[in-house]
Interface confidence: medium
């Protein structure tokens, strides 16, 4: 028999349950897991099912983004009577099963985290053979990736009326605050964080008018750290040179 499960309840652990007489599917995932970029994270997922002592073919799947339709980032399959869940897909080789599916544990380990990994993940288990059944977490677990600031670009650009402006773009989570310092700017912070503009963890700050030659420094800071980068403005006969 084949059934599509529909989640009916959820508690603080995101325990998703399907109940009917003499059988019960449920999946437990935490609402959120936090980890720092570069580190590893564990995405816990356990389940219960109505098929007592099931030892038939089994597939464990993790998706990203959205349930049921999101792209798979990990998939492994175990043959009947086998505990070896052979990995068929591990995106960029960074995903591996931490749990034992035969013990109803689909927990996943994600290595070398990047800010791009900050999204929601959904676990799924499929039974085949004598029993055909499947279940997927609908709410999933949100992986929150934090990172110290990193300045990804700093530049000087021409602007109207033979003037120059400076741009500084940084990434980090929490999104970093950006500040400029330089000639005639004193010790004051000359710019604040700009809107994120839908670019995920990227933040850009502009210094609209560079009025003096010299070194201009962009500082990016959040709760995890700070980063600095500089550009130099020298005007020769109306031309400019800028270097980082």
């Amino acid at each position: 028999f084949v059934r599509t499960k529909i989640d009916t309840t959820e508690n603080l652990l995101n325990t998703e349950v399907h109940s009917s007489p003499a059988q019960r599917w449920s999946m437990q995932v935490p609402p959120e897991v936090s980890a720092e970029a570069g580190d590893a994270a564990v995405l816990p997922c356990t389940f219960t099912h109505p098929h007592r002592h099931y030892d038939g073919p089994l597939t464990a799947i993790w998706r990203a983004g959205e349930p049921y339709a999101g792209p798979q980032v990990f998939r492994c399959a175990a043959a009947r009577g086998s505990e070896l869940c052979q990995t068929a897909l591990s995106l960029h080789g960074r995903f591996r099963l931490l749990g034992n599916p035969r013990r109803n544990d689909l927990s996943l380990r994600v290595e070398r985290l990047a800010l791009a990994d900050d999204r929601r993940y959904f676990c799924r288990v499929e039974f085949a053979g004598d029993v055909h059944d499947r279940y997927e977490s609908r709410h999933g677990v949100r992986l929150h990736v934090t990172a110290a600031p990193r300045i990804v670009n700093i530049s000087v650009l021409p602007s109207p009326a033979h003037a120059f402006r400076a741009l500084c773009t940084a990434e980090g989570e929490p999104p970093p605050a950006l500040a400029w310092s330089g000639p005639a700017l004193g010790n004051s912070l000359a710019a604040v964080r700009s809107p994120r503009e839908g670019h995920g963890h990227l933040v850009t700050a502009e210094l609209p008018a560079l009025t003096h030659d010299g070194r201009y420094t962009c500082t990016a800071a959040n709760s995890l750290g700070r980063s600095e980068a500089s550009v130099y403005l020298f005007r020769f006969h109306g031309a400019s040179g800028a270097s980082t």
Partner: antibody, heavy 117, light 107 residues
Framework: QVQLVESGGGLVQPGGSLRLSCAAS????????MNWVRQAPGKGLEWVSY????????YYADSVKGRFTISRDNSKNTLYLQMNSLRAEDTAVYYC??????????WGQGTLVTVSS | DIELTQPPSVSVAPGQTARISCSGD??????VYWYQQKPGQAPVLVIY???DRPSGIPERFSGSNSGNTATLTISGTQAEDEADYYC??????????FGGGTKLTVL
């Protein structure tokens, strides 16, 4: 650093009860399944019980089923083993161990339980 | 339930290769884990998922699984490797099973 510290062991009479605790630190306790493993004096390792990260799944060795209960309090980063109807053959060093499909990758130093009259 | 059988003892000269076997029914369809335990200490995981090594474990430790026998191999055995070694796996009934242990003596 990652650490597990067991406590609660001691001398108990046959038929008595004891509750072991395991305090976890240095890692996100709520992300991991946990186990109890014991070792009788001069003997090998024997798995006792397993609990999933959310307490939704628990498993026991046949030798302790119905007598021992594993539990955890994720808010306190603590694992427990309630041992009832203790027998002389339960005498052992009891270890808590972090693990799941990757085996037991972190162990405590153990606590000795002696069942004797 | 599966039973894992290990030789009670294995001896090896320093610098030589030590092999410790672990046999059990249908072991080829299971993950095998190996632990090292020195006197008075807690066990330490040295091999997981049959042939993977945790960080911090020397490269001389390796694992393999063929047929119904898993093997822990220690190449270039050192005096500090003298210890008890245990294999472990899962049973389909959700029981964890350990082998009886092997005492490795470095001569």
């Amino acid at each position: 650093q990652v650490q597990l510290v067991e406590s609660g062991g001691g001398l108990v009479q046959p038929g008595g009860s004891l509750r072991l605790s395991c305090a976890a630190s240095g890692f996100t306790f709520t992300n991991y399944a946990m186990n109890w493993v014991r070792q009788a004096p001069g003997k090998g390792l024997e798995w006792v019980s397993y609990i999933s990260y959310s307490s939704s799944n628990t498993y026991y060795a046949d030798s302790v089923k119905g007598r021992f209960t594993i539990s955890r309090d994720n808010s306190k980063n603590t694992l427990y083993l309630q041992m009832n109807s203790l027998r002389a053959e339960d005498t052992a060093v009891y270890y808590c161990a972090r693990g799941a499909g990757l085996g037991y990758d972190v162990w405590g130093q153990g606590t000795l339980v002696t069942v004797s009259s | 339930d599966i039973e894992l059988t290990q030789p009670p003892s294995v001896s090896v000269a320093p610098g030589q290769t030590a092999r410790i076997s672990c046999s059990g029914d249908n072991l080829r369809s299971k993950y095998v884990y190996w632990y090292q335990q020195k006197p008075g200490q807690a066990p330490v995981l040295v091999i997981y998922d049959t042939n993977d090594r945790p960080s911090g474990i020397p490269e001389r430790f390796s694992g393999s699984n063929s047929g119904n026998t898993a093997t822990l191999t220690i190449s270039g055995t050192q005096a500090e490797d003298e210890a008890d070694y245990y294999c472990q796996t899962y049973d389909m009934t959700s029981q964890d099973v350990f082998g009886g242990g092997t005492k490795l003596t470095v001569l």
